[in-house]
């Protein structure tokens, strides 16, 4: 007898889920520097906010030279997961103020998640680690007021916004090392 | 067309040693993390090892741990799976598994009997 | 005794539709982890069926689809046919093994 019959190929292999999760990535970049802008329409913004709940920002234009696959899909995935977090936070407790803007964030967070599914079956199909978020999750409670909320989503949308930007260029770098 | 086919199974006294051979073709080898998957007779599916798409990262079931060796060589398309001290437990089916897995081989029967 | 539990067996009549769970727990499906689902039919190797809870591999036809919630996902079969009688396997990665659980299996059965 001859070999045995080979498998079909399935819809996309590590490159074009990389090429892929570029994609998404600026897709999703554009969709929060446009949700920002938004934001600082209605509500105009008085300096900087942050949230301690958030994650720091993973890396500078500096250290971007000297990325590893494993390090900055694995940080990616996790910084993601916490902000995927914080927009159904703010969704389910931004109150009235928000409610306005409900249809771009359920946007924005089925993006997230399309992504998060996606860096994640790229890390499968390399058998790169995958572990789970190693920093304890912290219990989002309500918004102190209702300014109290759309402080926290000036401070969401912006990390977001650096995370996704310094993404882009992270999986751009590594797209040439596979 | 992808192709994994598996080599190297046969019968073995406890104690014993095989090495299984997976050679690839018709995708790209070297992009992809493979898997070596078992299966007992009658049984359900168990993950064995898998080792990353450049070989960087290795990981065992606890069954396995420190018995079994998996190693890749991407210039001959190649996957390996080193065996030692082999038990009856270890009877089954190889298969070896690319990606996710998303492909499979036709798989290798190891006998471990005396 | 698997990570993921499967009911052992399921069964339907033909173009009926069957459902087969997959429960994980926190630590994978609960932790973010997807899920994909494979068939085996008799005497061959598995085949990938689902992945990422819900995707279909070109060649699989649109009778099979795949959920996921919480901590458990689910592969629905509609318009059962007598060559879907196989085994169906759910995975999923787990951390604690850097390598994917498998379901102990579902031995489907076409009445």
């Known amino acids: 007898p001859g070999p045995p019959a080979g498998s079909p190929r399935v819809s996309s292999d590590p490159r074009a889920d990389l090429d892929s999760a570029v994609l998404l990535t600026r897709s999703l970049l554009a969709d929060t520097r446009q949700l920002a802008a938004q934001m600082r329409d209605k509500f105009p913004a008085d300096g900087d906010h942050s949230l301690d709940s958030l994650p720091t920002l993973a890396m500078s234009a500096g250290t971007l030279g000297s990325l590893q696959l494993p390090g900055v899909l694995t940080r990616l995935r996790v910084d993601l997961m916490s902000y995927l977090r914080h927009v159904q936070w703010l969704r389910r407790a931004g109150g009235p103020s928000l409610k306005t803007l409900e249809p771009e964030l359920g946007a924005l967070q089925a993006r997230l998640e399309r992504l998060l599914r996606r860096l994640q079956l790229l890390m499968s199909r390399l058998a790169l680690p995958q572990a789970a978020p190693d920093q304890p999750v912290i219990p989002l409670g309500p918004p102190a007021s209702a300014w109290g909320s759309i402080r926290a989503a000036h401070a969401i949308l912006g990390g977001l916004h650096l995370t996704l930007d310094w993404a882009v260029r992270g999986l751009l770098l590594l797209k040439t090392r596979l | 067309e992808v192709q994994l086919l598996e080599s190297g199974g046969g019968l073995v006294q406890p104690g014993g040693s095989l090495r299984l051979s997976c050679a690839a073709s018709g995708f790209t080898f070297s992009s992809y993390g493979m898997h070596w998957v078992r299966q007992a007779p009658g049984k359900g599916l168990e993950w064995v090892a898998v080792i990353s798409y450049d070989g960087s990262y290795k990981y065992y079931a606890d069954s396995v741990k420190g018995r079994f060796t998996i190693s890749r060589d991407n210039s001959k398309n190649t996957l390996y799976l080193q065996m030692n001290s082999l038990r009856a437990e270890d009877t089954a089916v190889y298969y070896c598994?690319?990606?996710?897995?998303?492909?499979w081989g036709q798989g290798t029967l190891v006998t471990v009997s005396s | 005794q698997s990570v993921l539990t499967q009911p052992p067996s399921a069964s339907g009549t033909p173009g009926q539709r069957v459902t087969i769970s997959c429960s994980g727990s926190?630590?994978?499906?609960?932790?973010?982890?997807?899920v994909h689902w494979y068939q085996q039919l008799p005497g061959t190797a598995p085949k990938l069926l689902i992945y990422s809870n819900e995707e279909r591999p070109s060649g699989v036809p649109d009778r099979f689809s795949g959920s996921k919630s919480g901590t458990s996902a689910s592969l629905a079969i509609s318009g059962l046919r007598s060559e879907d009688e196989a085994d169906y396997y759910c995975?999923?990665?787990?951390?604690?093994?850097?390598?994917?659980?498998f379901g102990g299996g579902t031995k489907l059965t076409v009445l």
């Open positions: 926190s630590s994978n499906i609960g932790s973010g982890y997807d």
């Open positions: 598994a690319a990606g996710v897995p998303d492909y």
């Open positions: 995975a999923a990665w787990d951390p604690s093994l850097s390598g994917p659980v």
